[in-house]
C-alpha cells in the first residue's frame, strides 16, 4: 500500500482554482526527492504535468505550480483557470519516475451554473437552522403567508400562517413576523438535513397580485479534513459543533458502509477495540470537545465523524464534523510489544520511547482510567513527584539523548494491571500505550533482600544483601535510594581486581549495601536492581526504618548529617558516599493534584520489556501510602 495520501476526489468550477495537498512519510529521502503531478491516460501511462524539478507542461504554463513543504511532509499542487478539459484522473507522487509511490486523485471541473438574479440563496451546514426572509407588499399584509418546496410537478407546502405544517417539518418549521414590520415574514427551519436542500417559494397573497420569492436552500455536508498519521502514533479529533449543542451528549463514530459506529461518547459508551487508548475531553461551554486516540493501528484508518445528540448516537439533522484518517505504515515510531507481563510481588521495567530530537522534553507516565470520559492521571514524571500511593515502588529513569526513558514499578499487585501511557510535553505523536498484565507469582522471586526485617539503629552499621540468580551474573547490579523524585543510584567503584569465574555458585551471588554509620536521613526505601547498560531489568524494594539506640520509636528529627553507604558486590568492597538530603525521614510526595491529569494524551500503543518471572516482594507491607506499617516486620 502506498504511503502517499491526498484527496481522492476534487471538484471545482470552470474558471476557479484548486489546491491539492499530498502527504508523504517523514524521511530525509522523501523530503528531498522529486515530487510530481501527472495525468493518467487510457493506456495506463501517467504524463507529467508539473514536478518539483522545475518541469512544467505546456497546458499548465502560467497557471500551475508545485510547492514542497518539507517541514509538514506535504507538497501542494495549485492549478488556476480551470476548464472542463482538466477533468480527469491524476496522480500525485514521489520518485524519479512516475512509477514511484503515488496517490490517485480524481478531478472534476463543471460548467459555471448561472442563477436567476432574483433568487435568494441560503447556504447552511447539516444540522444547523435557516431563517428565510420573505418580503411582500403592504396590500398583502392581511393575506395568507406560506412557504412551499418545489417538487417536479408542484410546490409542496412546508408551513403557512394558518398553522398548517407538513408532517416532515413538524417541530422544525416556524413562520413568524418581527415587530411591527408588515412587509416581511420569516420562516425558520431547524435541524436541517440533506432532504431539505432544494428550491422553495415563499408567497404572500393569492392570484396575480401575490408576492412570490424564489429561495434556493443549500444544505452542506461537512468537507472531511484529511489527517495523515504514523502507525503507533496518536491522533486528536478536535470537534467544534457550536454553542447550540453545548449541552448535548457528544460522540465520535467511524463510518462503516451506511452506518456510523460509535467509538466513544460522553455517556460512557466505548468500543472495546479502543480500550486503554482513547479519551474524550469536553473543552468548553461552546460545544467544543476533543477525542484522542493513541497506539494507532492500520485498521484505524477510515472516515470519522463527530456529532452531538442527547442519545450520544448519530442522528440526522444534528451538526457533524468529519475527517479522513490515513495511517502511514512506514512509521518512525519504534515497534515494540504492546503488553508487559509481570507477577505479583515482582517488578516491570518499561522502556518508553520519545522523539530523540527532544531529549530535554519532560517525560511522564500516566494510568489510563476508563471511567466517565476516560482520563490519564500522571503517576510520575521528570518534574512530577510520584503519586503517594506509589511511594517506594515507582520511579522514572531518564536517559537523555537515546530516545528512551524507563519507568520501573515494583511490589506489583493484581490491581496494577491495566493500561498506562508514556508521554512527553514534546512531540505528541510519540505517546505510547502499554497494557500491564499481572499474574499470581508461582515461584520464588529472582531478587531477594535479607534481612527482610530492616530496622537500622542510629549511629551503628547496618548491612542488607540482595541475592540474585546466576542468570544475572553478567549484568550490572545496583542499589538505589528511592525518593519521590526518582531512585538515586548509589555511586560505587571497584576496589579490588575481580576474580573471573566460569562457574557460578547459586548460593553466593549477592550485592550488599552497608550504611555506616546509620543516620536518620537513611530511613526510607531502597531498591536492589539489575541493568545492562541503559536497559533496566528487575528490581526489588526494601524499607529501612531507623531507630534510636535507646528507644523503639522510628521517628527521628531531621538533621543535615550525610549517610555513608558501602555497596559490596560479591568479593569486592565498594564504597559509596550518599549525600542525598531529604526534607523528611520518610519521603512523602504530598497530595498529587488531580489537575495533573493528562487528559488529551495518547498516541500509540506499544510496550516494553518486563521480566517474565519478575522479582520479589521483600516482606514489606506494600500498602505504601501507609508509612507507619513499614516498621512492623
Amino acid at each position: 500500500k502506498s504511503p502517499i495520501f491526498g484527496p481522492q476526489e476534487v471538484s471545482s468550477i470552470e474558471g476557479d482554482s484548486v489546491s491539492i495537498t499530498c502527504y508523504y512519510p517523514d524521511t530525509s529521502v522523501n523530503r528531498h526527492t522529486r515530487k510530481y503531478w501527472c495525468r493518467q491516460g487510457a493506456s495506463g501511462m501517467c504524463t507529467t504535468l508539473i514536478s518539483s524539478n522545475g518541469y512544467l507542461s505546456k497546458e499548465y504554463s502560467g497557471r500551475a505550480n508545485l510547492i514542497n513543504f518539507p517541514e509538514n511532509n506535504t507538497f501542494v499542487i495549485n492549478i488556476e483557470q480551470l476548464t472542463q478539459d482538466d477533468t480527469g484522473s491524476y496522480k500525485c507522487g514521489l520518485g524519479t519516475s512516475n512509477r514511484g509511490l503515488s496517490f490517485d486523485v480524481s478531478l472534476e471541473v463543471s460548467q459555471v451554473p448561472e442563477l436567476p438574479s432574483d433568487t435568494h440563496v441560503y447556504t447552511k451546514d447539516i444540522g444547523r437552522n435557516v431563517t428565510i426572509e420573505c418580503p411582500f407588499k403592504r396590500e398583502n399584509a392581511p393575506s395568507k403567508k406560506s412557504l412551499c418546496k418545489k417538487t417536479n410537478q408542484s410546490c409542496e407546502l412546508v408551513i403557512d400562517s394558518t398553522e398548517k405544517v407538513n408532517p416532515s417539518y413538524i417541530g422544525r418549521a416556524k413562520l413568524f413576523m418581527k415587530g411591527t414590520d408588515l412587509t416581511v415574514f420569516y420562516v425558520n427551519i431547524s435541524h436541517l438535513t440533506h432532504n431539505d436542500a432544494g428550491l422553495y417559494i415563499c408567497q404572500a397573497g393569492e392570484g396575480p397580485s401575490a408576492d412570490k420569492k424564489n429561495v434556493d436552500l443549500q444544505v452542506l455536508a461537512p468537507e472531511p479534513e484529511l489527517l495523515y498519521k504514523d502507525l503507533r502514533s496518536s491522533v486528536t479529533f478536535e470537534c467544534d459543533l457550536g454553542r447550540e449543542v453545548a449541552n448535548e451528549a457528544k460522540y465520535l463514530c467511524r463510518m462503516n458502509k451506511e452506518t456510523c459506529d460509535v467509538i466513544i461518547n460522553t455517556l460512557g459508551k466505548r468500543d472495546p477495540d479502543f480500550e486503554g487508548r482513547i479519551l474524550i475531553t469536553p473543552k468548553d461551554d461552546n460545544g467544543r470537545f476533543s477525542v484522542l486516540i493513541t497506539g494507532l493501528r492500520k485498521e484505524d484508518a477510515g472516515h470519522y465523524q463527530c456529532g452531538a445528540h442527547s442519545s450520544g448516537l448519530p442522528q440526522e439533522g444534528w451538526p457533524i464534523q468529519t475527517w479522513q484518517l490515513f495511517v502511514n505504515e512506514e512509521s518512525t515510531i519504534p515497534n515494540r510489544r504492546s503488553v508487559v507481563k509481570g507477577v505479583t510481588g515482582g517488578s516491570v521495567a518499561i522502556a518508553c520511547p520519545y522523539n530523540p530530537k527532544e531529549s530535554s522534553s519532560l517525560k511522564y507516565w500516566c494510568r489510563w482510567e476508563g471511567d466517565g470520559n476516560g482520563h490519564c492521571p500522571v503517576l510520575v514524571g521528570t518534574q512530577a513527584q510520584v503519586q503517594e500511593e506509589y511511594e517506594g515502588r515507582l520511579a522514572l529513569f531518564d536517559q537523555p539523548g537515546n530516545g528512551t526513558y524507563t519507568v520501573i514499578l515494583n511490589q506489583l499487585t493484581t490491581e496494577d494491571a491495566g493500561f498506562y501511557w508514556c508521554l512527553t510535553n514534546g512531540d505528541s505523536r510519540w505517546r505510547t500505550t502499554i497494557e500491564l498484565q499481572v499474574a499470581e507469582a508461582t515461584r520464588e522471586p529472582n531478587l531477594e533482600v535479607t534481612p527482610q526485617n530492616a530496622t537500622a539503629v542510629l549511629g551503628e552499621t547496618f548491612t542488607v544483601s540482595c541475592h540474585y540468580p546466576c542468570k544475572f551474573y553478567s549484568q550490572e547490579k545496583y542499589w538505589c535510594k528511592w525518593s519521590n523524585k526518582g531512585c538515586h543510584i548509589l555511586p560505587s567503584h571497584d576496589e579490588g581486581a575481580r576474580q573471573s569465574s566460569v562457574s557460578c555458585d547459586q548460593s553466593s551471588q549477592l550485592v550488599s549495601m552497608t550504611l555506616n554509620p546509620v543516620s536518620k536521613e537513611d530511613e526510607g526505601w531502597y531498591w536492589c536492581g539489575v541493568k545492562q547498560g541503559q536497559t533496566y531489568g528487575e528490581t526489588t524494594a526494601i524499607y529501612i526504618a531507623v531507630e534510636e539506640r535507646t528507644r523503639g520509636s522510628s521517628h527521628v528529627n531531621p538533621t543535615d548529617a550525610n549517610a555513608r553507604a558501602k555497596v559490596a558486590l560479591e568479593e569486592e568492597v565498594v564504597d559509596s558516599s550518599i549525600s542525598e538530603k531529604e526534607n523528611k525521614a520518610i519521603p512523602n510526595p504530598g497530595p498529587f493534584a488531580n489537575e495533573r491529569e493528562i487528559q488529551n494524551v495518547g498516541d500509540q500503543a506499544q510496550e516494553n520489556r518486563a521480566s517474565g518471572d519478575a522479582g520479589s516482594a521483600d516482606g514489606q507491607s506494600r500498602s505504601s501510602s501507609s508509612k507507619h506499617h513499614h516498621h512492623h516486620h
Epitope: 451554473p113 438574479s117 432574483d118 433568487t119 435568494h120 440563496v121 441560503y122 447556504t123 447552511k124 452542506l220
Partner: nanobody, 123 residues
C-alpha cells in the same frame, strides 16, 4: 468574524482589463455567498456579481454580463473579479462582501464588507 481585503484596483484605459482579489480571513468561506458591489461618486451602491462558495453557482449583473467573471480559489479563501473590456462607466470603488443567505443582489443581505478598492477607467 470574517475580515475581507480587496486589492487589484488601479487606473486602466478603456478596453483594458483588471483582476480584483478579495481575500478572506477569520473563517472559511465555505458556507457563504461572496459578492462584488460597486459605488460611483453620487450613485447608489450597485450589485456586480456573486458566487455561492459551496457549489460555485454565480450571478452576474446585466450591465457587466459577458465582460466580468467572478471566480474563487478554495485554498486561498479568495474570490476574484476578472474585468475585461472596461468602460468609463465601470469606474467606481469596488467592494467585496459576504452573506450567509438572502437575495444575491441586495446589499442588505450581506453581513461583512471590505474597505473597497478604486477602479479608474480613462477614455
Amino acid at each position: 468574524e470574517v475580515q475581507l481585503v480587496e486589492s487589484g484596483g488601479g487606473l486602466v484605459q478603456a478596453g483594458g482589463s483588471l483582476r480584483l482579489s478579495c481575500a478572506a480571513s477569520g473563517r472559511t468561506l465555505r458556507s457563504y455567498i461572496v459578492g462584488w458591489f460597486r459605488q460611483a461618486p453620487g450613485k447608489e451602491r450597485e450589485f456586480v456579481a456573486a458566487v455561492t462558495w459551496s457549489d460555485g453557482r454565480r450571478v452576474t449583473a446585466d450591465p457587466v454580463k459577458g465582460r466580468f467573471t467572478i471566480s474563487r480559489d478554495n485554498a486561498k479563501n479568495t474570490v476574484y473579479l476578472q474585468m475585461d473590456s472596461l468602460k468609463p462607466e465601470d469606474a467606481a470603488v469596488y467592494y467585496c462582501a459576504v452573506s450567509h443567505g438572502g437575495a444575491y443582489v441586495e446589499s442588505r443581505a450581506y453581513e461583512y464588507w471590505g474597505q473597497g478598492t478604486q477602479v479608474t477607467v480613462s477614455s
